[in-house]
């Protein structure tokens, strides 16, 4: 079948990095500069992606593969193949329409991207709190108190008032 196909379609012999040039009796021609073909038998080469502005080149375009972009410092990729760059925030913040905003009390974000998430509720599993949450870190739960079996509630001690220079416990 492959032999028959190649007899019928000479373009199938054109390897990646070339295209089947109809203007030149279907001769395999190299892809022109700033273009590529990643598979054989192509009738055209694709234009290379250009990484401009907030995008920067992670991998240069070659005759057989497209360029790959990532984002300049202070931004991170979103979407398939880094189709967009979104502004970074600090840990303990999330990006809103008005820019980076601190996580509300009871929520945290331990990354430079994404949204603030609620602290784990240790008491839902009948567990104690070993380390209280902060804007940047989730709560750490610990063993169940002796006077409560797993599943019981009201084991999370109230968060102490913040002391200057420290996060709460």
């Amino acid at each position: 079948f492959e032999r028959t196909r190649s007899l019928q379609d000479p373009c199938s012999n054109c390897p990646a990095g070339t295209f089947c040039d109809n203007n030149r009796n279907q001769i395999c021609s190299p892809c022109p500069p700033n273009s590529f073909s990643s598979a054989g038998g192509q009738r055209t080469c694709d234009i290379c992606r250009q990484c401009k502005g907030v995008f920067r080149t992670r991998k240069e375009c070659s005759s057989t593969s497209n360029a790959e972009c990532d984002c300049t410092p202070g931004f991170h990729c979103l979407g398939a193949g880094c189709s967009m760059c979104e502004q970074d925030c600090k840990q303990g913040q999330e990006l809103t329409k008005k820019g980076c905003k601190d996580c509300c009390f009871g929520t945290f974000n331990d990354q430079k991207r994404g949204i603030c998430r609620p602290w784990t509720n240790c008491s839902l599993d009948g567990k104690s709190v070993l380390v209280n949450g902060t804007k940047e870190r989730d709560v750490v739960c610990g063993p169940s108190p002796a006077d409560l079996s797993p599943g019981a509630s009201s084991v999370t001690p109230p968060a102490p008032a913040r002391e200057p220079g420290h996060s709460p416990q």
């Epitope: 784990t120 567990k127 070993l130 380390v131 870190r137 750490v140 420290h166 996060s167 416990q169």
Partner: antibody, heavy 122, light 107 residues
Framework: EVHLLESGGGLVQPGGSLRLSCAAS????????MGWVRQAPGKGLEWVSI????????YYADSVKGRFTISRDNSKNTLYLQMNSLRAEDTAVYYC???????????????WGQGTLVTVSS | DIQMTQSPSSLSASIGDRVAITCRAS??????LAWFQQKPGKAPKSLIY???SLQSGVPSKFSGSGSGTDFTLTISSLQPEDFATYYC?????????FGGGTKVEIK
């Protein structure tokens, strides 16, 4: 590298008091619960007490409840164990240990200090 | 209180042997179990947490398994440095409790 160094052990008479200290370095002290575990000569390990990262939560073994008090000074990266009304059965090596956690749950001890010997005898 | 029962209390084994130590909890503790190694005159060292997770820096010859009430620490090929006492610890609930220890000796 995490380093824990206990001090304050020694010989004390029954009914007496002693205060153990544990100087911590190599990690963000206030972000970790800390604990004390003891080991009587030739015996196994016995948990004594745990204190939460900010000092607000404390837990004790029944054998020491009402006599021992765990505390911490996060500004000095130091953990304490105040031991009152000491008894012969409190004789042991006392280890300070950082409480390990993975994700949002913890409660085991890693690492441990080298220990300090408390001997209660007349 | 949750009682932790280790068995055997001691065992003799040869270099290269596969060794298994068991720990049984008096009630279910999910996977809230740790294993420690202690050599004479030294502080305990954490080997395994969450029943089967290897502590950073611990060689892969140590492995842990189990959930609920029955747990096992396995040393795949015993080496001279592995002769020590091993303890389990539950951290499902207070009071935290340790097993009585298993002393691994040279045969």
């Amino acid at each position: 590298e995490v380093h824990l160094l206990e001090s304050g052990g020694g010989l004390v008479q029954p009914g007496g008091s002693l205060r153990l200290s544990c100087a911590a370095s190599g990690f963000t002290f206030s972000s970790y619960a800390m604990g004390w575990v003891r080991q009587a000569p030739g015996k196994g390990l016995e948990w004594v007490s745990i204190i939460g990262g900010g000092g607000g939560s404390t837990y004790y073994a029944d054998s020491v409840k009402g006599r021992f008090t765990i505390s911490r000074d996060n500004s000095k990266n130091t953990l304490y164990l105040q031991m009152n009304s000491l008894r012969a059965e409190d004789t042991a090596v006392y280890y300070c240990a950082k409480v390990g956690y993975s994700g949002t749950y913890g409660g085991w001890f890693d690492p441990w200090g080298q220990g300090t010997l408390v001997t209660v005898s007349s | 209180d949750i009682q932790m029962t280790q068995s055997p209390s001691s065992l003799s084994a040869s270099i290269g042997d596969r060794v298994a130590i068991t720990c049984r909890a008096s009630q279910g503790i999910s996977n809230y179990l740790a294993w420690f190694q202690q050599k004479p005159g030294k502080a305990p060292k954490s080997l395994i947490y969450a029943a089967s997770s290897l502590q950073s820096g611990v060689p892969s010859k140590f492995s842990g398994s189990g959930s609920g009430t029955d747990f096992t620490l396995t040393i795949s090929s015993l080496q001279p440095e592995d002769f020590a006492t091993y303890y389990c610890q539950q951290y499902n609930s207070y009071p935290l409790t340790f097993g009585g220890g298993t002393k691994v000796e040279i045969k």
